[in-house]
Amino acid sequence: FERTRSLQDPCSNCPAGTFCDNNRNQICSPCPPNSFSSAGGQRTCDICRQCKGVFRTRKECSSTSNAECDCTPGFHCLGAGCSMCEQDCKQGQELTKKGCKDCCFGTFNDQKRGICRPWTNCSLDGKSVLVNGTKERDVVCGPSPADLSPGASSVTPPAPAREPGHSPQ
């Protein structure tokens, strides 16, 4: 079967890094400069991606795999395969159409990318604010206010010793 298949379609035997060359009687030719084929049996090679401008080359193109780009310092990748580069902001900021803007009160961003997110609402979990939030950091929630009432201890008292022969009440 293999022999029959290869005689019917010689292109099926062309490995990755080559293409089935009609100009050379359908023998497998190497992909030309700045192109690649990542799978076998190709009739053409794909043009290598070029990492220009704000993109920089993370991995060079080879005859069997495309180039991979990342972003120059001050920018970060967005999209599948780093299809876009977006400007970094500082922590405590978010990128808007007008550039980097500080997070509004009550929100924070602890990264150089992404949007400002609201501080955690500790009271929703019945807890209190232990450390206040900032533009760069979320609040830190602590024990519930009831746990902090006068006379309350954060240390659980030991269980009373049981006398033998008595079941617990």
């Epitope: 890094g17 060359d21 050379r24 030719s29 030309p32 400069p33 080879s62 005859s63 069997t64």
Partner: nanobody, 121 residues
């Protein structure tokens, strides 16, 4: 033009090794890729191994892991180290040089005269 001279073929037992050489002379500046193809009687010419001027290598599926292509730029020579040879590797092995990619095809396409490799006990 480019002249290609192959050497190193011969008779070898299954499991044995051979090293083919292909020496290029002439207008070698025009060459982008060099490599080896083989043709057994009644079969199509198939790619064995290729190496580009940038150093990328490609191998035919049937020889991966057994054959290694390399080059010596100073000597303008390409080598094919063939290990763990099998009877099905028996063929005439041709050296090929390609260059001048223009308008969707290679302008320069040079072939050696071929060297016979026979794998038999």
């Amino acid at each position: 033009a480019v002249q290609l001279v192959e050497s190193g073929g011969g008779l070898v037992q299954p499991g044995g090794s051979l090293r083919l050489s292909c020496a290029a002379s002439g207008s070698i500046f025009s060459i982008y890729a060099m490599g080896w193809y083989r043709q057994a009687p009644g079969k199509q010419r198939e790619v064995v191994a290729l190496i580009t001027s940038g150093g990328s290598t490609v191998y035919g599926d049937s020889v991966k892991g057994r054959f290694t292509i390399s080059r010596d730029n100073a000597k303008n020579t390409v080598y094919l180290q063939m290990n763990s040879l099998k009877p099905e590797d028996t063929a005439v092995y041709y050296c090929n040089a390609l260059g001048g990619w223009e308008n969707g095809k290679y302008k320069y396409d040079y072939w050696g005269q071929g060297t016979q490799v026979t794998v038999s006990s």
